[in-house]
């Protein structure tokens, strides 16, 4: 029973349980393909426990292997719309520091209006994740249609 | 070595490792869009460790942040079928208690026959998750095509 | 503080944090629908911590419930290509030992060029996971478009 007590007394952060789930705040200006995210209990069911937001982009605070997941739904979209505006592509990557810049996850919409995926990837303290949506369609801001999150899995 | 021993001696439930993976049992009667789930080793590779089923719906037993995931494939489906019967939509949400009712995850099939997604969300003991499939197509009952699960991630 | 120290002193393997993320190496010869995977820091962001590769297939080293996830993108693909070459199907399953052979996860591409999904499933030490891609289209080898991984979740 001592372990359970000790576990409860330790701050969760020391267990490495960094986790975040974000909702879409807004898209960038015309030449900026990035999606800008927001999170926090006041906004609904989004949250940040460990990672932080830096101008709408997610910054990692703890080294480790993370499960990164995302779903993006296009607004006012049908399969006809999606195919007409192809290619619409979503990419998740490390955008800073520049020395670690890399695309982690990439999907095209083709004739669909939603993409959803997830992957495991090593991330380091200070890595900032950017989500780039290229194309001429807007992402839905509905919190059950568009979201982005990370979960620390192991060192 | 003492920690490893202590960890083994503690029931897993005290570590908060609640997890469930369910397979489709049946659809509801005509006016009920809910999918009804089942789980347990006798049924194959589905299981419930912590959460419970209440009339085919998943009830949470431990507060925390959960990874919720789902895949639903439509039966005898082609891209023509899927587009013809649009909108066919799947929504996962908290359906009880009514005070906490909210849609957590929503996807449309458009010209595809399978949707799959996942998200992190806070859930509380007593929350019941419902999966609503609206449209005129049947979900596949094959266990490798349609499944629904949750995994406790952190308090 | 003693718990945190003890946790750090224990090898991670004893905590059961087996995890792997793989990138596509190559496809099989004509009659072999399996995808052959590779992983390791020298290759980029793929890794194996616990599980091993056996002739390009993933072998599990620890009993437990795992989150299995995959994304496969077809090379030089458009919705027209995908629908023309239908059915193109991806299946993830236990392929050995033969006594435990079963399909865990199955998706068709229909009019899309990417599939992505995830599920929780019990796996046992010695289980080898195979990913079968049937059809006449090649999978992309880009590491942000095609990947396959597992994460140990609980005993």
């Amino acid at each position: 029973q001592r372990f359970a007590q000790a576990q409860q007394q330790l701050p969760l952060e020391s267990l490495g349980w960094d986790v975040a789930e974000l909702q879409l705040n807004h898209t960038g200006p015309q030449q900026d393909p990035r999606l800008y995210w927001q999170g926090g209990p006041a906004l609904g069911r989004s949250f940040l426990h460990g990672p932080e937001l830096d101008k709408g982009q997610l910054r990692i605070h703890r080294d480790g292997i993370y499960m990164v997941h995302i779903q993006v739904t296009l607004a006012i979209c049908s399969s006809t719309t999606a195919s007409r505006h192809h290619p619409t592509t979503l990419a998740v990557g490390i955008c800073s520091p520049a020395s670690r810049s890399i695309s982690l996850l990439r999907l095209s919409f083709h004739q669909g209006c939603t993409i959803a995926s997830q992957r495991l990837t090593p991330l380091a303290r200070g890595d900032t994740l950017c989500t780039n949506l290229t194309g001429t369609l807007l992402p839905s801001r509905n919190t059950d249609e568009t979201f982005f999150g990370v979960q620390w899995v192991r060192p | 070595q003492r920690f490893a021993q202590a960890q083994q001696q503690l029931p897993l439930e005290s570590l908060g490792w609640d997890v469930a993976e369910l397979q489709l049992n049946h659809t509801g009667p005509q006016q009920d869009p809910r999918l009804y789930w089942q789980g347990g080793p006798a049924l194959g590779r589905s299981f419930l460790h912590g959460p419970e089923l209440d009339k085919g719906q998943l009830r949470i037993h431990r507060d925390g942040i959960y990874m919720v995931h789902i895949q639903v494939t439509l039966a005898i489906c082609s891209s023509t079928t899927a587009s013809r019967h649009h909108p066919t939509t799947l929504a996962v949400g908290i359906c009880s208690p009514a005070s906490r009712s909210i849609s957590l995850l929503r996807l449309s099939f458009h010209q595809g026959c399978t949707i799959a997604s996942q998200r992190l969300t806070p859930l509380a003991r007593g929350d019941t998750l419902c999966t609503n499939l609206t449209g005129t197509l049947l979900p596949s009952r094959n266990t490798d095509e349609t499944f629904f699960g949750v995994q406790w991630v952190r308090p | 503080q003693r718990f945190a120290q003890a946790q750090q002193q224990l090898p991670l393997e004893s905590l059961g944090w087996d995890v792997a993320e793989l990138q596509l190496n190559h496809t099989g010869p004509q009659q072999d629908p399996r995808l052959y995977w590779q992983g390791g820091p020298a290759l980029g962001r793929s890794f194996l911590h616990g599980p091993e590769l056996d002739k390009g297939q993933l072998r599990i080293h620890r009993d437990g419930i795992y989150m299995v996830h995959i994304q496969v993108t077809l090379a030089i693909c458009s919705s027209t290509t995908a629908s023309r070459h239908h059915p193109t199907t991806l299946a993830v399953g236990i392929c050995s030992p033969a006594s435990r052979s079963i399909s865990l996860l199955r998706l068709s591409f229909h009019q899309g060029c990417t599939i992505a999904s995830q599920r929780l499933t019990p796996l046992a030490r010695g289980d080898t996971l195979c990913t079968n891609l049937t059809g006449t289209l090649l999978p992309s080898r880009n590491t942000d478009e095609t990947f396959f991984g597992v994460q140990w979740v609980r005993p």
Epitope: - | L24, Q30, T73, A75, I76, T80, R84, H85, T136, L137, L138, S140, R141, N142, E145 | -
Partner: antibody, heavy 120, light 111 residues
């Protein structure tokens, strides 16, 4: 409750065409395939084809070798089945039918049937 | 096309007794965890009436003395206790693929 009401009996000459109508009420016409099934006197049931009124897509039984044409008018919730190059063996009761909830080809609702007699 | 073969062609059963009609498909009509097999009852001068869908599901309003079973290629319609109003022709039908096809029918009479 869905109701399917068909047009009245017809007597036709061999080589001519017949067009049977089926008016739907009480349901969402455009969301479900409307099927046509025929039954020759004292014989079994034979599926002829179907239309999805939402977009006009059709499926036909190849046994009719292009002689059958199914159309739909969403504005009046009416489906039509036209059979050309009639011969005596086309004498049958023609039914329209559809599912109640799931849009697969089993048939909860049926029209009352239209007897088409082909005789010289 | 999938060929549906019913047996017997005709059947005479005493009131209150069990009636069993079989239907065999020339290939499996099961897919996605369902059996796409359905049963109808047709009385003279009336359109067919759906009794059972997806092999074993009782259509709303149909008496529970009717039941269906089977999977793959072999299916059975059972009337547990025959009533006078059950005299009719019974058809099986698949909807696994296009075209859907019907069995030739089984005529059920009272012995």
């Amino acid at each position: 409750e869905v109701q399917l009401v068909q047009s009245g009996a017809e007597v036709k000459k061999p080589g001519s065409s017949v067009k049977v109508s089926c008016k739907a009420s009480g349901g969402t016409f455009s969301r479900y395939n409307m099927h046509w099934v025929r039954q020759a006197p004292g014989q079994g049931l034979e599926w002829m084809g179907a239309i999805f009124p939402g977009n006009g897509e059709t499926s036909y039984n190849q046994n009719f070798k292009g002689r059958v044409t199914i159309t739909a008018d969403k504005s009046t919730s009416t489906a039509y089945m036209e059979l050309s190059s009639l011969r005596s063996e086309d004498t049958a009761v023609y039914y329209c039918a559809r599912n109640s909830y799931y849009d697969y080809a089993w048939f909860t609702y049926w029209g009352q049937g239209t007897l088409v007699t082909v005789s010289s | 096309d999938i060929v549906m073969t019913q047996s017997p062609d005709s059947l005479a059963v005493s009131l209150g007794e069990r009636a069993t009609i079989n239907c065999r498909a020339s290939k499996s009509v099961s897919s996605s965890g369902y059996s796409f097999m359905h049963w109808y009852q047709q009385k003279p001068g009336q359109p067919p009436k759906l009794l059972i869908y997806l092999a074993s599901n009782l259509e709303s309003g149909v008496p529970d003395r009717f039941s269906g079973s089977g999977s793959g290629t072999d299916f059975t319609l059972t009337i547990s206790s025959l009533q006078a109003e059950d005299v009719a022709v019974y058809y099986c039908q698949h909807s696994r693929e296009f075209p859907p096809t019907f069995g030739q029918g089984t005529k059920l009479e009272i012995k």
